[in-house]
Amino acid sequence: LVITPPGPELILNVSSTFVLTCSGSAPVVWERMSQELPQEMAKAQDNTFSSVLTLTNLTGLDTGEYFCTYNDSRGLEPDERKRLYIFVPDPTVGFLPNDAEELFIFLTEITEITIPCRVTDPQLVVTLHEKKGDIALPVPYDHQRGFSGIFEDRSYICKTTIGDREVDSDAYYVYRLQVSSINVSVNAVQTVVRQGENITLMCIVIGNEVVNFEWMYPRKESGRLVEPVTDFLLDMPYHIRSILHIPSAELEDSGTYTCNVTESVNDHQDEKAINITVVESGYVRLLGEVGALQFAELHRSRTLQVVFEAYPPPTVLWFKDNRTLGDSSAGEIALSTRNVSETRYVSELTLVRVKVAEAGHYTMRAFHEDAEVQLSFQLQINVPVRVLELSESHPDSGEQTVRCRGRGMPQPNIIWSACRDLKRCPRELPPMLLGNSSEEESQLETNVTYWEEEQEFEVVSTLRLQHVDRPLSVRCTLRNAVGQDMQEVIVVPHSLPFKEQKLISEEDLGGEQKLISEEDLHHHHHH
């Protein structure tokens, strides 16, 4: 190969045009950074081949290595590739740009490396420094390559002066990787297989080039050897993998599989083990218990969760009152089954903003060709209690009655209480409970109805008061598992005129006389 002009180093002017010619006994090509350049190729009558590279409007970024090589360079000797280095001194370009691979320099041993900071002008003085350091380091510099030497794990920058300005290069990070220790990892495609299926295990070593693998496994103990396969993971430097493959597993292949790795240079070793289970046939097993009766609160969201183990992966279906459920487009129901480990699953039914109609009989069924399991429960929708009505009346019999009506699910309990001393109750005196004593002063009658369509209970309770001799605050409190509600009414003696405003003495109300209207007396509603 002949290059014209011959080089090996050329200094060209910025903005100029320059022609390079390469000729040889076979087709030749110009390359830069492993890329072919636009060029004109020709064949002369004397069977010599040439390629002409025209560099136009040169800038500092054209500084670098140019190679001429035979077009089909496989199997060529090193001297059948010619290198030319071109400088284009350009004051607008400081250091030539580097890609990330050049900025981060990883080492596996103590060896000479090059910090590739290059300038466009071979006359410039370049110095090497620790990043943010002023002292120049005594390391030799080659304008075509950079600083070469043995470097500690630090970050470095190069400096030069162009005209009257100091220019810094990017920082270069030198990082030494530890490769002496062996770290083995073992994993299996599956740790549970059915008999007749394959067992495949992989043992991986990172960061060591020369290692020996040894496998221990149940078959080996009975003298039936399996030949492992070793390969290199191409996209990962020095990741070496040994694969142990046992086709058509038998029940006796259950047990511990151990990969032992040794490297001969430093005589290090490591081993890791994994357990494999071979089952006769697939299985589905429920884990934990789900009560036969589940609850959800009206208008709240509720997630019902079933945990089970299965192999192979099952199909999971949910039913309500024997009809198949699916994710609803309105977002009222969401179904999901997650694989939380190799053989463990969590299936969830989420009811969003629960409605009364969603009460019913639910079933989850998980199955595959070998086994199935199902789990059922009744879902009850709990509705917080509401007092719907609290009214007072005085029938002709002379007694006074207070009627309280409310609803909720589960069935509400009703508690009647009264306050005689309006001044001090309920802050200072606890209200007295009514209706649960044998005294003749008050009688209680309670009826409970279950409304099928609304799926809730209605409680109607009537409190009969025999003789009321002073204003009495009567409270009806309804309670169930998900809430409570209460209302109060003030019952006044018969002797006070009712249809007009009532004058209650200051003794009753504490501190002052006060006119209380019928509305005041009858509507004290608490939640």
Epitope: N98, D99, A100, E101, L103, F104, Y173, Y175, G207, Y238
Partner: antibody, heavy 127, light 107 residues
């Protein structure tokens, strides 16, 4: 001198959009991952997102996913944060920084920190 | 998601004191941790990366240690410039997470 300068901050109404820019100088911009970090008034630092050298990999915090987009123009040495559908909680000083992420070594990755930061630009979301 | 918790939230100290700030990760993060210093009204500044590597130009009174879930930043002898807020930061290949910060103020 290695420098990052943010711009484009200002007052924006909730639901509105804003585009922040970060101009880089003094280093080979195209060789580095870049990151946006924000700091709400009186609060700590929060990573917003980052972008690799050629823009083919982008990652962001969940709270801005689908609303903010990070991009870069290596020819202009510029990093961008397009903020759409902004919320009051996006009010903060936004910093851009250089993220030192070396090429992966096998399945190992290394990280040398955010070593260069801009002075920040203030975004106020208010009606 | 991994949570980073710093303690204490505030620390009062005097010039010359030895100061230790702790950062805990909610799960094992190996040594994927950096420390930053932020002075009022300024941008953060990288101090430590990979849990214990000192960034160039950072005074040697700063040091980092720890791995797994527990990390510490130690300031050997507190200087006037060191009154600031310090943040730990976890990184992985797709995200970064900062601790809530530790403010070091004058006692």
């Amino acid at each position: 001198e290695v420098q990052l300068v943010e711009s484009g901050g200002g007052l924006v109404q909730p639901g509105g959009s804003l585009r922040l820019s970060c101009g880089a100088s003094g280093f080979t911009f195209s060789s580095y991952w870049m990151t946006w970090v924000r700091q709400a008034p009186g609060k700590g630092l929060e990573w917003v997102g980052n972008i690799n050298q050629d823009g083919s990999e982008k990652y962001s915090v969940d709270s801005v996913k689908g609303r903010f987009t990070i991009s870069r123009d290596n020819a202009k040495n510029s990093l961008y944060l397009q903020m759409n559908r902004v919320r009051a909680e996006d009010t903060a000083v936004y910093y851009c920084s250089r993220d030192l992420v070396p090429p992966r070594q096998g399945d190992n990755y290394y990280y040398f920190g955010m070593d260069v930061w801009g002075l920040g630009t203030t975004v106020t979301v208010s009606s | 998601d991994i949570q980073m918790t710093q303690s204490p939230s505030t620390l009062s100290a005097s010039v010359g004191d030895r100061v230790i700030i702790t950062c805990r990760a909610s799960q094992n993060i190996n040594n994927w941790l950096a420390w930053y210093q932020q002075q009022p009204g300024k941008a953060p500044k990288l101090l430590i990366y990979e849990a214990s590597s000192l960034e160039s130009g950072v005074p040697s009174r700063f040091s980092g240690s720890g791995s797994g879930t527990e990390f510490t930043l130690t300031i050997g002898s507190l200087q006037p410039d060191d009154f600031a807020t310090y943040y730990c930061q976890h990184y992985n290949s797709y995200s970064r997470t900062f601790g809530q910060g530790t403010k070091v103020d004058i006692k």
